[in-house]
């Protein structure tokens, strides 16, 4: 897909990119780099998610609770207490 | 080569749904997260969340939490996007886009305008 | 979250003089852990989806000119197109990448002088 790469103003061929990417350190939070040859993938440590581990499952600020529930935090994840009559991961 | 191909556009009622396909070809689907953008007639660029196809796992912005579905089949290498209680205001071209980790939303579709009138 | 902010909205400049668009963050956007910055810029024509140019805030993606370039660090960034072409003519878009919502600057318009 990609032929050629500029990494800083530096070209990195495409050869280049499939053995070194994960040196890129793309993913964050420590996540790891795990590249399947035709793709890179982020192992994400407990508590986050996303494409690069950037996504933080223990904050509320990143998710509403439908319904008038309410966002709990804590050991890594975050949950909805829902009101009377709903349920399920977001209250709906 | 890589390749997003979406749903063709929509007329919708406020108050109705839109499901909106996005059908990828060229790369193994499971491998890279797809997210949603839209844009307004005239507007700037918003995202919407993404999903993540090896799992199903999602991520909204708040705004559209309880309102947007993300999904994906695997067996036919298709995201979709459907989002409900339309308003006038819902009004955008939607896209979807490739995450390709160290290169972030490398591919996108053609988009797919979905008009809310009544 | 994380609220970027570009300037100016629109730009007017002559064939083959330069062109340079900011872009600011409300927090930083480098990870200190591996001292990339989580940036991107990209171009929208009319009529078309936008197109990836800069990510990591200074990395060009395969094919762009040479003669677009990202710059900044922290929550200060910079696309610069060194010499304007008329084909350059677009809507671009920062969008930061650090953490989730992932959210775009408001768009700069440039055109021809």
């Known amino acids: 897909d990609h032929h050629h790469h500029h990494h800083e103003q530096k070209l990195i061929s495409e050869e280049d990119l499939r053995v070194d990417r994960c040196s890129l350190q793309p993913c964050r939070n420590g996540g790891l780099c795990l590249d399947l040859g035709h793709a890179l993938r982020c192992r994400c440590r407990a508590g986050f998610a996303g494409p690069r581990c950037e996504h933080d499952l223990d904050d509320c600020a990143g998710r509403a609770c439908a319904n008038g529930g309410t966002c709990v935090e804590g050991g890594g994840a975050h949950r909805c207490s829902c009101a009377l009559g709903f349920g399920g991961r977001d209250c709906r | 080569q890589v390749q997003l191909v979406q749903s063709g556009a929509e007329v919708k009622k406020p108050g109705a749904s839109v499901k909106v396909s996005c059908k990828a070809s060229?790369?193994?689907?499971?491998?890279?997260?797809m997210h949603w953008v839209r844009q307004a007639p005239g507007q700037g660029l918003e995202w919407m969340g993404w999903?993540?196809?090896?799992?199903?796992?999602?991520n909204y912005e708040q705004k559209f939490q309880g309102r947007v579905t993300m999904t994906r089949d695997t067996s036919i290498s298709t995201a979709y996007m459907e989002l409900n209680r339309l308003r006038s205001d819902d009004t955008a071209v939607y896209y979807c886009?490739?995450?390709?980790?160290?290169?972030?939303?490398?591919?996108w579709g053609q988009g797919t305008l979905v008009t809310v009138s009544s | 979250d994380i609220v970027m902010a570009q300037s100016p909205d629109s730009l007017a400049v002559s064939l083959g003089e330069r062109a340079t668009i900011n872009c600011k963050s409300s927090?930083?956007?480098?990870?200190?852990?591996?001292?990339?910055?989580?940036l991107v810029w990209y171009q929208q024509k009319p009529g078309q989806p936008p197109k990836l140019l800069i990510y990591?805030?200074?990395t060009r993606e395969s094919g762009v000119p040479d003669r677009f370039s990202g710059s900044g660090s922290g929550t200060d960034f910079t696309l610069t197109i060194s010499s304007l072409q008329a084909e350059d003519v677009a809507v671009y878009y920062c969008?930061?990448?650090?953490?989730?919502?992932?959210?775009f600057g408001q768009g700069t318009k440039l055109e021809i002088k």
């Open positions: 886009t490739r995450d390709a980790v160290v290169i972030p939303m490398d591919y």
């Open positions: 060229g790369y193994t689907f499971t491998d890279y997260y």
């Open positions: 999903i993540n196809p090896n799992s199903g796992g999602t």
């Open positions: 927090q930083s956007v480098l990870d200190t852990s591996n001292n990339k910055n989580y």
């Open positions: 990591w805030a200074s």
């Open positions: 969008q930061h990448y650090y953490n989730s919502p992932y959210t």
